[in-house]
């Protein structure tokens, strides 16, 4: 899950074990190359962050639904 400890930007070191409903999400960012592993951080409608594995099909589908433009976390 996102971790700001000892890294220059938010990074995900573990992923959510739940497949979140798409309707609960409003946006996403892709973590930067400075992070040890690539990850997607979804933001929920309640303003919370959820880490997800970009290799999973549902994550890829959600990213398409939330916007085709690439979203990369700024550092």
């Amino acid at each position: 899950q996102p971790d700001a400890l000892n890294v220059p930007s938010t990074c995900c070191f573990t992923f959510s074990s739940k497949k979140i409903s798409l309707q609960r999400l409003k946006s996403y960012v892709i973590t930067t190359s400075r992070c040890p592993q690539k990850a997607v951080i979804f933001r929920t409608k309640l303003g919370k962050e959820i880490c997800a594995d970009p290799k999973e099909k549902w994550v890829q589908n959600y990213m398409k639904h939330l916007g085709r433009k690439a979203h990369t976390l700024k550092t």
Epitope: P2, D3, S16, S21, R24, L46, K48, E49
Partner: antibody, heavy 119, light 107 residues
């Protein structure tokens, strides 16, 4: 496996401030995506959500208690804390700390600590 | 705040019975509902999230359904270890609200 453990005084006098601490083990409290919550349960009653804190220090408090509560985080000790001021007998309850992974589901709980407000 | 109303407040059933608990929200909450089990003297345990998804490790005899304002929690074949109080919780809005609980006893 993340575990949570509450600690604090079991007895508090009316009008005083209640302070409780939740110690996180088996994982870093600094990990984002984890939201650290306080929830209480009055004797024989249901559950009442108090509020949460995020690793960044962002908080959200239940408006019904907002004027009396503060939730803080100490990443160096892997702990987060609740303070509740001006307590009355109505604040007598079991206080739980709990984690949610950003998905608004409390999947890990402490065992709870009973706090009695009495003179 | 959203009000969550559970019914019944208590019920008694026999081992093997199908048990149903309902939870009604005071406004539309889509499927933003969790169910918890709390055994005496213990902390609550998450059973179901998003109204119908079983949490990892939870027996398949537990299930949930519903959306909008009306939700149902079902135990298909009641076991002695299911004796507990069950709570619903909404997360459509902050602050989160819980139902008042349903206490389940064995006949």
């Amino acid at each position: 496996q993340v575990q949570l453990q509450e600690s604090g005084p079991g007895l508090v006098k009316p009008s005083q401030t209640l302070s409780l601490t939740c110690t996180v083990s088996g994982g870093s409290i600094s990990s984002g995506g984890n939201y650290w919550n306080w929830i209480r349960q009055h004797p024989g009653k249901g559950l009442e959500w108090i509020g949460y804190i995020y690793y960044s220090g962002n908080t959200y408090y239940n408006p019904s208690l907002k004027s009396r509560i503060t939730i803080s985080i100490d990443t160096s000790k892997n702990q987060f804390s609740l303070t509740l001021s001006s307590v009355t007998a109505a604040d007598t309850a079991v206080y739980y700390c709990a984690r949610d992974g950003g998905d608004d589901a409390f999947d890990i709980w402490g065992q709870g600590t009973m706090v009695t407000v009495s003179s | 705040d959203i009000q969550m109303t559970q019914s019944p407040s208590s019920l008694s059933a026999s081992v093997g019975d199908r048990v149903t608990i309902t939870c009604q929200a005071s406004q539309d909450i889509s499927n933003y509902l969790n169910w918890y089990q709390q055994k005496p003297g213990k902390a609550p345990k998450l059973l179901i999230y998003d109204a119908s998804n079983l949490e990892t490790g939870v027996p398949s005899r537990f299930s949930g359904s519903g959306s909008g304002t009306d939700f149902t929690f079902t135990i298909n074949s009641l076991q002695p270890e299911d004796i507990a109080t069950y709570y619903c919780q909404e997360y459509n809005n902050l602050p989160y609200s819980f139902g008042q609980g349903t206490k389940l006893e064995i006949k």
